[in-house]
């Protein structure tokens, strides 16, 4: 079994809806800086035949820009194969679909290998609530603190959102 | 004094399962993601699988998926790599190493063991 951590109960289904990007973290900061290429933020979230789809928002020029993105579903429950910026499998490493959900890609660009980490909320006024879940899951990929950035409103496209 | 010393290597039918160890000792847990790479001969050193300091999370080269499992004991030192459904084109040497962070990549494993034959053939 790849990683001991299963898909929601009940489904991808219950990721499906609005999400808020809290925190990033990376090995590699550039990734994450402004204007880095993993510096991203998620708007919604629907699952179908297994896939995951998500509606992320790209700042760009001063504007953040909505892109849709497919992660597909792989033989291991818990782990997606996403093209963007090279090759990422993609980890759902802690899900609770009312909550929170933290994810971790090993990007793959070029003959550049990178990790980069995800925390994202339902309910923004909770967001520090599961930045300790997300702390604890990095920890234990290699990620350390000071490799993580909590994102701040102006950071995540909030003026984007419908 | 950091070391990793593997075991349970030896020569399997096509078909068959083995379970290597990878005994790790003196390192602190800023090196304490275990990876398994081969060697086949004439070849270059690869990734097979690595898994996190805890053991809750777990990377597989795609070619091992869904046949090999890394799993790791913390209260003994050991990560295990079971190997099953064993082909010929395993045949290998299998080494282990320790590193700081869950990538497939040899530059990211500071410590390596001495490693132990893996050989599949009929």
């Known amino acids: 079994q790849e990683g001991n951590h299963e898909e929601p109960q009940g489904g991808l289904e219950e990721l499906s809806g609005r999400w808020h990007s809290v925190a990033l973290a990376s090995n590699k900061s550039d990734l994450i800086k402004p204007w880095g290429h993993f510096r991203v933020f998620i708007h919604s979230m629907s699952a179908k035949d297994g896939n995951l789809h998500g509606d992320i928002l790209i700042p760009q020029d001063g504007q953040c820009e909505k892109v849709s993105l497919t992660a597909f579903k792989t033989a291991t429950s818990n782990k997606f194969d996403l093209e963007y910026w090279g090759h990422n499998d993609l980890y759902l490493a802690e899900v609770d679909p009312k909550s929170y959900l933290i994810l971790y890609m090993i990007n793959q660009y070029n003959d550049d290998t990178s990790l980069v980490a995800h925390l994202m909320v339902r309910d923004l006024s909770r967001q520090q609530d599961f930045l300790p879940a997300f702390e604890s899951v990095c920890e234990d990929i290699g990620l350390h603190k000071d490799q993580i950035v909590v994102l701040s409103d102006d950071d995540r496209c909030q003026g984007s959102r419908d | 004094q950091v070391q990793l010393v593997e075991s349970g290597g030896g020569l399997v039918q096509p078909g068959g399962s083995l379970r290597l160890s990878c005994a790790y000792s003196g390192f602190t847990l800023d090196n304490n993601v275990i990876g398994w790479f081969r060697q086949a001969p004439g070849k270059e050193r690869e990734f097979v699988a690595a898994?996190?300091?805890?053991?809750?999370?777990?990377h597989y080269t795609e070619s091992v998926q869904g046949r090999f499992t890394i799993s790791r004991d913390n209260a003994k030192n050991t990560v295990y790599l079971q190997m099953n459904s064993l082909k010929p084109e395993d045949t290998a040497v299998y080494y282990c190493?320790?590193?700081?962070?869950?990538?497939?990549?040899?530059?990211?494993?500071?410590?390596w063991g001495q490693g132990t034959q893996v050989t599949v053939s009929s």
């Open positions: 898994i996190s300091r805890s053991g809750a999370f777990t």
């Open positions: 190493a320790a590193g700081a962070i869950l990538l497939p990549t040899e530059r990211r494993y500071d410590y």
